[in-house]
Amino acid sequence: LSTCKTIDMELVKRKRIEAIRGQILSKLRLASPPSQGEVPPGPLPEAVLALYNSTRDRVAGESADPEPEPEADYYAKEVTRVLMVDRNNAIYDKTKDITHSIYMFFNTSDIREAVPEPPLLSRAELRLQRFKSTVEQHVELYQKYSNNSWRYLGNRLLTPTDTPEWLSFDVTGVVRQWLNQGDGIQGFRFSAHCSCDSKDNVLHVEINGISPKRRGDLGTIHDMNRPFLLLMATPLERAQHLHSSRHRR
Amino acid sequence: LSTCKTIDMELVKRKRIEAIRGQILSKLRLASPPSQGEVPPGPLPEAVLALYNSTRDRVAGESADPEPEPEADYYAKEVTRVLMVDRNNAIYDKTKDITHSIYMFFNTSDIREAVPEPPLLSRAELRLQRFKSTVEQHVELYQKYSNNSWRYLGNRLLTPTDTPEWLSFDVTGVVRQWLNQGDGIQGFRFSAHCSCDSKDNVLHVEINGISPKRRGDLGTIHDMNRPFLLLMATPLERAQHLHSSRHRR
Amino acid sequence: ALDTNYCFSSTEKNCCVRQLYIDFRKDLGWKWIHEPKGYHANFCLGPCPYIWSLDTQYSKVLALYNQHNPGASASPCCVPQALEPLPIVYYVGRKPKVEQLSNMIVRSCKCS
Amino acid sequence: ALDTNYCFSSTEKNCCVRQLYIDFRKDLGWKWIHEPKGYHANFCLGPCPYIWSLDTQYSKVLALYNQHNPGASASPCCVPQALEPLPIVYYVGRKPKVEQLSNMIVRSCKCS
């Protein structure tokens, strides 16, 4: 490339690489790379790889526009996942015969273990794997609000698909709300969209780990694919560091 | 400001001002400022000011994140508005006694007059003015699809308000679709959100220019505030210019 | 758009996204990031000429604003437009961590 | 953020948004734009130091990345981050036109 003076492409690349070295450590709030002396031998644990792949898949589907980056968003976010309370739990009993909806409950103490304080949460996604399907359906997501009431969160038009497909809903606000309350069981309802004059109010979508027809409860494989919350949060120690050094340059 | 060499702030400002001179003309695809010899004397017409104010209000509520700007988006967009077909039109007759919804019909020939070709449309917003209200309601917007079917477009949770408030829905895709079809009457339905087990399916929101209780059809004032489409489009002559010069730098 | 599709397949001299793959072990001497082994970081490079609007060929000058100085800057600069995050896996002591780093991959550039 | 709230009320020497009001008649000699009479265009200015990671005071250096070179550029540059459009009214012959110009007002800046 030539401008007024010739650009040394190799120097630019070297400077970019050096800057990335600092950028990664800076985003992780590490003064130096972590030592590998204590790393257990062998491949990465299955669950860690699954979590990494979930995150990578999310990135691939993410819009690539640069978002203005507040200080807290510059830093890396730890990714964890919290599985839905097992279907055998008694909490599901009263939802058995409802045809327009399926229900997913979560233990907020599991969420709090991953995200000790509400402001640390940067994003929470509810992930559901739908089985392949030949029908189109308009579906809605609700949050359990009080004893028997549900608050509308969002909707999706699900088109037919030949392969199982992961659905993702942004539930950051809801999870932050849960973290502000005491521990307990909280939940979501995934429903058919019932319009004011519609007659067919049956949910035709089948969700892995919930839909009774093909539970396939074969331990781990089923476990990996049952609905879960994907959480992105600032680790507590990084947040404390952030808080204590909140001064301007 | 001082870096290695002192920055001449006045020079920077002058260069920025000169660049803006070029930028505005460039965005309007004008080689020079338009002559003012033919401009009618007196203030701007009422309707033009109303349209300008609508656009300015929209900007104020708009997120200020930079959106990646494809070539077509760099250029200025002409703003026009198309009012809803008057409520006295026979097309509204069959919608009179429906309590869960209100209906808004538009003449696509009016839209085509403003936007002669579908690709020229850059954004279309449906604007409704709701009266002040003490109730919270979850509402939905539908597009007329075929004879008696409606396609879901979006929803909004409307909270109580002490003052009349403008609601805005992005209907760009719908209007582009209409432009691709022949002329005729097309419409939207604004409904209460009816959940699968909800009993109260009445729309409590009152919309200026529609809600029968307080029509106040007093010519212009009412006319200004009845539902309309706010259209942003590349003017035809600018688009032709664009098309002919689509080469890379 | 000055994106990977256009820039990687052209010999654009002006502002464009340039290819750069970073191998953590080879380029940074790091073996602590377990996944991925590297990533396409890319970078923006190339001039964004400041356009003097007093140029005699004014209509030609105006056509250049779109690419060279769309933001009407006093000194336009070639910078990232679209960015993507990068998830990584690393260990802290014996504990594996999955973290997401925002704005790590340059997908397109712009004069700003 | 390096936005109007922070930058207009500080004497920041590094990258920041700077105040600039453009009066169409006075600054550009134009009377053809009927509305608005002018607008707060603003602009970005100030250094974004490139940070060498071989600096001995490394932990201090890392803390500066966030502001000075968050995108890990080889030569970071002070550019607009948040922009807003500007609607204008002007005449073409006898016909008034309302048009919206995208990305005209600089609300905040960043090192990129």
């Epitope: 003064a31 130096s32 030592s35 120690e237 | - | - | 490394y58």
Partner: antibody, heavy 118, light 107 residues
């Protein structure tokens, strides 16, 4: 201020055991692993082992496996190192040191001299 | 275990001198090399970690460099308080191992 304060000097007979304490202050005790390092008179430093106060996970250098026992009391932010079956060549200054995940010891105790003599 | 060989084992120098101590590892330790200062009756102090990073509060006359198996600690201009024993330590692979020390004395 981050500090590690160790117990006082000990004199022990061969075959006996010694338990050295290390009280941490100025930081969250469970957030950092505690390591133990010793230094025989006129010699270099020798790593003995470490404990994770949060999980209780322990790792010993092979040489001290079976003879050293590391424990913590999180309620008092104190780490302990017990060495049994003492021999005269165990005479040394014993240090506790806070480990940073970067692979270095950023804070050290002042040391505890243990003398093994009959 | 990785062997750490430090040299010299002792050295005499004067205030204002530039001093260099080296440390060689028996295998590549990928920059996980740290330097400590020890004074009689005082707690050991971390000076430099990860080859060249200065620990907070350490004067900038101390610097580190190196890669692979060979590393260096440099004191650019000796001060009276710098006379002490210096140790290197590798943080790459368990068990953590130290050099045998370099005693820096006043000439």
């Amino acid at each position: 201020e981050v500090q590690l304060v160790q117990s006082g000097a000990e004199v022990k007979k061969p075959g006996a055991s010694v338990k050295v304490s290390c009280k941490a202050s100025g930081y969250t005790f469970t957030s950092y692993w505690m390591h133990w390092v010793r230094q025989a008179p006129g010699q270099g430093l020798e790593w003995m082992g470490r404990i994770d106060p949060q999980s209780g996970g322990i790792k010993y250098a092979q040489k001290f496996q079976g003879r050293a026992t590391l424990t913590v009391d999180t309620s008092t932010s104190t780490a302990y190192m017990e060495l049994s079956r003492l021999r005269s060549d165990d005479t040394a200054v014993y240090y506790c040191a806070r480990w940073d995940y970067g692979g270095y010891f950023d804070v050290w105790g002042q040391g505890t001299l243990v003398t093994v003599s009959s | 275990d990785i062997q750490m060989t430090q040299s010299p084992s002792s050295l005499s120098a004067s205030v204002g001198d530039r001093v260099t101590i080296t440390c060689r590892a028996s295998q590549d330790i990928t920059n996980y090399l740290n330097w400590y200062q020890q004074k009689p009756g005082k707690a050991v102090k971390l000076l430099i970690y990860y080859t060249s990073r200065l620990h907070s509060g350490v004067p900038s006359r101390f610097s580190g460099s190196g890669s692979g198996t060979d590393y260096t600690l440099t004191i650019s201009s000796l001060q009276p308080e710098d006379f002490a024993t210096y140790f290197c330590q590798q943080g790459d692979t368990l068990p953590w191992t130290f050099g045998q020390g370099t005693k820096l004395e006043i000439k």
